[in-house]
């Protein structure tokens, strides 16, 4: 597993540097799990022939993965600090069942991916001290998450590698989008 | 091999809108952390940043020309496009355009075009 | 916006000198810090990532160093073909910007 923001070797290396802004903690703390999601991919692609596939084949699926658009906030057009804050703690949220189901999804990998679960909850807490309006922010249905979880566990072996594929690839561009947003502010 | 190629209409008049495509290949614009921006320098000046659009088409746009600026894209036709209105001689200049990729977003202008020259002038 | 300064505008040097060129942030940028070189009626190219992240095809004598808002390039033995202006680029935040330049030219 990658080493944990604070702990890289540039932060041994200079004893002497400020302690880290919340923002800067933010930014290192997306750029770990970043790193975690490459290794997993890796080992996902390794093993099917998902990552090959078409943009558009893969859209054919019904996993509801929270994704960036215009009207939250985030973008340069419509930029709102406040309405893109929500947005993304409330899409990390969603996305935690589809982290818990990838737990079981590698065997290489398992410790990364337990690292990049663990490494999100701590993310979430880092933005909500930074949001202001925390009852703006709606946290997922635990049976609905329970009931979702169980119904991805039950597709077959294909199903399941691209479901796989497909979490990774979501969160991979939504951390992206998220990590251009919050440097902006 | 990455490769990045701008045209442009080369001489324009004041008060004209200038249209520039960047046309390139070897990498995808639908991939997630790809961008590609603008850029342009005066002879003799340096280097001025106009705009940059991503993967998922947020569009960036330098404040003090923000009015006069245009960024798009054709991500199937592998081109982005830049338009500025209402141009004066203050924009003549050679105008690049660079690719940006990388999982964190360091906005590294990694791949250069080799230039278009754009002179406005009456 | 973050506004990049560099120092010195021109630096004469000789073949073989060690030289390092400065550049400074108004604001703390962490590592999104980037070197690039242009030689005459050449485009830029990109010759360090990140403070000191080597780009391939980019010679060894090349290095960077720097955190938050103070940042060095350094050449370890200046050859010839090193001749003209290095800008570095605020990759933090839009919007993007550059130094002026410096400019290394041969005594």
């Known amino acids: 597993a990658p080493v944990p923001p604070g702990e890289d070797s540039k932060d041994v290396a200079a004893p002497h540097r400020q302690p880290l802004t919340s923002s800067e903690r933010i930014d290192k703390q997306i750029r770990y799990i970043l790193d975690g999601i490459s290794a997993l991919r890796k080992e996902t692609c390794n093993k099917s022939n998902m990552c090959e596939s078409s943009k558009e084949a893969l859209a054919e699926n019904n996993l509801n993965l929270p994704k960036m658009a215009e009207k939250d906030g985030c973008f340069q057009s419509g930029f709102n600090e406040e309405t893109c804050l929500v947005k993304i703690i409330t899409g990390l949220l969603e996305f935690e069942v589809y982290l818990e189901y990838l737990q079981n999804r590698f065997e290489s990998s398992e410790e990364q991916a337990r690292a990049v679960q663990m490494s999100t909850k701590v993310l979430i807490q880092f933005l909500q001290k930074k949001a202001k309006n925390l009852d703006a922010i709606t946290t997922p249905d635990p049976t609905t998450n329970a009931s979702l979880l169980t119904k991805l566990q039950a597709q077959n072996q294909w199903l399941q590698d691209m479901t796989t594929h497909l979490i990774l690839r979501s969160f991979k561009e939504f951390l992206q989008s998220s990590l251009r947003a919050l440097r902006q502010m | 091999q990455v490769t990045l190629k701008e045209s442009g209409p080369g001489i324009l008049k004041p008060s004209q809108t200038l249209s520039l495509t960047c046309s390139f290949s070897?990498?995808?614009?639908?991939?997630?952390?790809?961008?590609v921006g603008w850029i342009r320098q005066p002879s003799g000046k340096g280097l001025e940043w106009l705009a940059h659009?991503?993967?998922?088409?947020?569009?960036y746009y330098n404040p003090s020309l923000k009015s006069q600026l245009t960024i798009s894209k054709d991500t199937s036709r592998n081109q982005v496009f830049l338009k500025i209105t209402s141009v004066d001689t203050a924009d003549t200049a050679t105008y690049y355009c660079?690719?940006?990729?990388?999982?964190?977003?360091?906005?590294?202008?990694?791949?250069w075009g080799q230039g278009t020259s754009v002179t406005v002038s009456s | 916006d973050i506004v990049m300064t560099q120092s010195p505008a021109t630096l004469s040097v000789t073949p073989g000198d060690r030289v390092s060129l400065s550049c400074r942030a108004s604001?703390?940028?962490?590592?999104?810090l980037h070197w690039y070189q242009q030689k005459s009626h050449e485009s830029p190219r990109l010759l360090i990532k990140?403070?000191?992240q080597s780009i391939s095809g980019i010679p060894s004598r090349f290095s960077g160093s720097g955190s938050g808002s103070d940042f060095t390039l350094s050449i370890n033995s200046v050859e010839p073909e090193d001749v003209g202006v290095y800008y570095c680029?605020?990759?933090?935040?839009?919007?993007?910007?550059f130094g002026a330049g410096t400019k290394l030219e041969l005594k």
């Open positions: 660079a690719r940006s990729y990388d999982d964190y977003l360091y906005y590294a202008l990694d791949y």
């Open positions: 070897g990498f995808s614009l639908s991939t997630s952390g790809m961008g």
């Open positions: 659009i991503w993967w998922d088409d947020d569009k």
């Open positions: 604001q703390s940028i962490s590592d999104y």
């Open positions: 990140s403070v000191s």
């Open positions: 680029q605020n990759g933090h935040s839009f919007p993007l910007t």
